[in-house]
Interface confidence: low
């Protein structure tokens, strides 16, 4: 691989719409990782600092951003569902994580939304109790 | 797989940090359906996915848009899929 | 916290109408959602309809067409307006929120619509 064209994910976990929890009493996390090259990543979901499997589904391949280039940048994406009592709970908590080239990546979900986000690439979400 | 009370939604969702990135999440729909590429190169949609909850016996379809377009909308970003109206689902404005 | 308090709930004939009413107090400002539910005797309880604060609505198939939800944000009421009421409508009618503040999910004590000739 041509190292100077390495470039690391962003990494950005969305929180589910209210609109999905009041019609269906479920919750849907998205995670994205975008902008990163090659397209050597693994994602994954933690809760409460667990690893899960359930209820995850992830792209099974990176999508060029650009697909007429041929270096072009990947993202990914991955979709965690879980009931609204167990988001809604303010004590559960969402990390989505992604691995490039032995960096771990991850954004997360916070309460406390001035804190700055540290430079790890993850998301997590913590069940809201506010914003 | 066989997908037991489809019920189609597209449904805006908020991330976690300022970013400018808007996410839209088309979910639920019937095995049948497919979802299109977008025409548009700064909008993203993945290829459908099935996720198993498998605590709750539940299986879902679903795919993903995301733009950092200004003027992207979840009602616009599956266009190219055939897509009911009242599959639109509003995204309440942050009261933070 | 959030208070909902539900009124306008009787006893109606068959195509009758009825407009039910669902005040809420507390922490307002931070409702995203509101929703009319019902529960009939020996059933689960069911959605009617949903409206946000940008007053999208949602209902469900059996109240298209005859129900309509609205809300007044000055008297931070929601109502839930019954035409052509039916005998399979006759339930006990539950006002929601959704918020953005822990617990979220908020219900009223609910109003009791009679459907009967």
């Known amino acids: 691989e041509d190292l100077k064209k390495v470039f690391p994910p962003k990494v950005a976990v969305f929180e589910p719409s209210e609109a999905e929890i009041s019609h269906t009493q479920k919750a849907t996390l998205v995670c994205l990782a975008t902008g990163f090259y090659p397209d050597h990543v693994e994602l994954s979901w933690w809760v409460n600092g667990k690893e899960v499997h359930s209820g995850v589904s992830t792209d099974p391949q990176p999508l060029k951003e650009q697909p007429a280039l041929e270096d072009s940048r990947y993202s990914l994406s991955s979709r965690l569902r879980v009931s609204a009592t167990f988001w809604h709970n303010p004590r559960n908590h969402f990390r989505c994580q992604v691995q490039f080239y032995g960096l771990s990546e991850d954004d997360e979900w916070t309460e406390d939304r001035d804190k700055p986000i540290t430079q790890k690439i993850s998301a997590e979400a913590w069940g809201r109790a506010d914003c | 797989p066989y997908i037991q009370n489809p019920d189609p939604a597209v449904y805006q969702l908020r991330g976690s940090k300022s970013n400018d990135t808007s996410v839209c999440l088309f979910t639920d729909f019937d095995s049948v359906m497919n979802v299109s590429q977008s025409k548009d190169s700064d909008v993203h949609i993945t290829d459908k996915t099935v996720l198993d909850m498998r605590s709750m016996d539940f299986k879902s379809n679903g795919a993903v848009a995301w733009s950092n377009k200004s003027d992207f909308a979840c009602t616009s970003a599956f266009k190219d899929s055939v897509i009911p109206a009242d599959t639109f689902f509003p995204s309440p404005e942050s009261s933070c | 916290d959030v208070q909902l308090v539900e009124s306008g709930g009787g006893v109606v004939q068959p195509g009758g109408s009825l407009r039910l009413s669902c005040v809420a107090s507390g922490y307002v400002h931070k409702i995203n959602f509101y929703g009319w539910y019902r529960q009939a005797p020996g059933k689960e309880r069911e959605k009617v309809a949903h409206i946000s604060i940008g007053d999208q609505t949602d209902y469900a198939d059996s109240a298209k067409g005859r129900f309509t939800i609205s809300r007044d944000e000055s008297k931070n009421t929601v109502y839930l307006q019954m035409n052509s009421l039916r005998p399979e409508d006759t339930a006990l009618y539950y006002c929601?929120?959704?918020?953005?503040?822990?617990?979220?999910?908020?219900w009223g004590q609910g109003t009791l619509v009679t459907v009967s000739s």
């Open positions: 929601r929120a959704l918020s953005r503040i822990w617990p979220y999910d908020y």
